[in-house]
Interface confidence: medium
């Protein structure tokens, strides 16, 4: 490699520090916050991205009704503990020794407790429902065009295998994207639906995680698709354990 390549970068994660100190002088990138090496040919795990974000300076309905067990991330940002493979540790604790259990996308799935709280396993989120409301347009989008464009986006930008995009529902102005991925379905090298959903969420908010890219310019047959509200519901393989029944949207 030439000297000009010494300023190597990570195309899939701008929240990295990169240098040519990998095997054979190859470009190696490490996530901010954790310092863990990341694979820049695919998406970085949500846990490492959240950790990097926290380390950065602060600045007749066809629609799906989320089940009573659906979780919404109401707790906001926190500095997570990630395992050596970049996944969320099942138990998360804050600096005041308050602990809780999370699912594979890092969303709290139990009441908060103290250091004695046990989280026996990291429960997999196998179904994600992304609920979008688009800004007013002259007319409704063609459902099949919208479906094709969103599937293409997840396949080509986030490299999510098409079989994991279960459905795209549309009832103007609401769009719902269903991602499904059981533990048994996810093969080595497959992008995780939780990571794809997180990259999509950040893209939609104009906070792209990709290096050197502008905001996501999502178009359906040339018509801009501008999102004004996003809600994401997470369903786990094992229902969450809260002491009081929580209201869902």
């Amino acid at each position: 490699h030439t000297a000009a390549q010494d300023n190597c970068t990570c195309p899939t994660n701008k929240m990295t520090v990169c240098s040519p100190d990998g095997p054979g002088g190859r470009c190696q990138c490490r996530a901010l916050g954790s310092g863990m090496a990341v694979d820049c040919s695919t998406l970085t795990s949500k846990c490492l991205l959240l950790k990097a974000r926290m380390s950065a300076p602060k600045n007749a309905r066809t629609l799906v009704r989320p089940s009573e067990h659906a979780l919404v991330d109401n707790d906001g940002l926190y500095d997570p503990d990630c395992d050596p493979e970049g996944r969320f540790k099942a138990r998360q604790c804050n600096q005041t020794s308050v602990c809780w259990c999370v699912n594979s996308v890092g969303v709290r799935r139990t009441d908060k407790g103290d250091l004695s709280l046990r989280c026996d396993e990291l429960v997999r989120t196998h179904h994600i429902l992304i609920d979008l409301r688009h800004r007013p347009t002259a007319g409704a989008f063609n459902h099949s065009d919208l479906d094709a464009e969103l599937r293409r986006l997840f396949r080509e930008r986030y490299r999510l295998h098409p079989k994991f995009v279960a459905a795209v529902h549309y009832e103007q102005p609401t769009i719902q994207i269903e991602l499904r991925q059981n533990t048994s379905q996810k093969a080595a090298g497959d992008v995780d639906i939780g990571d794809a959903a997180y990259y999509f969420e950040r893209d939609i908010k104009g906070e792209s995680l990709f290096q050197g890219r502008g905001g996501l310019d999502l178009r359906v047959r040339g018509e801009p698709l501008q999102v004004e509200r996003t809600l994401i519901y997470y369903l786990d393989e094992i229902p969450p354990k809260f002491s009081m029944k929580r209201l869902t949207a």
């Epitope: 195309p11 470009c27 310019d217």
Partner: nanobody, 123 residues
Framework: EVQVVESGGGLAQPGGSLRLSCAAS????????MSWARQAPGKGLEWVSG????????YYADSVKGRFTISRDNAKNTLYLHMNSLKPEDTALYYC????????????????WGQGTQVTVSS
């Protein structure tokens, strides 16, 4: 300094073949997806084909599917476009572009472009 330099263009007969090359330098070629795009006289830029960083997936515009083949040699930092069964409507200036995914064709968000190589298909 990042550079992408296209070559291999020229005059071809209808039904003929050409192979375009793109030599990249100044960035870590093996970690970036790459694309080919073209601009015909008096027309807008048209995305032609894209390939993932590791070559594991390729994409083509409908107009070239089955006739063009994109490939790459990461050891040589080179991108290729094999063009077969050429048609007069393939006449254009062909550009090599650094881009993460095929989806970037919607954004026009490529970071780096070459100067282009001219392909003319005529009898």
């Amino acid at each position: 300094e990042v550079q992408v330099v296209e070559s291999g263009g020229g005059l071809a007969q209808p039904g003929g073949s050409l192979r375009l090359s793109c030599a990249a330098s100044g960035f870590w070629f093996s970690t970036y997806a790459m694309s080919w795009a073209r601009q015909a006289p008096g027309k807008g830029l048209e995305w032609v084909s894209g390939i993932y960083a590791d070559g594991s997936a390729t994409y083509y515009a409908d107009s070239v599917k089955g006739r063009f083949t994109i490939s790459r040699d990461n050891a040589k930092n080179t991108l290729y476009l094999h063009m077969n069964s050429l048609k007069p409507e393939d006449t254009a200036l062909y550009y090599c572009a650094q881009g993460y995914s095929d989806y970037d064709r919607r954004v026009g968000g490529y970071d780096y472009w070459g100067q282009g190589t001219q392909v003319t298909v005529s009898s």
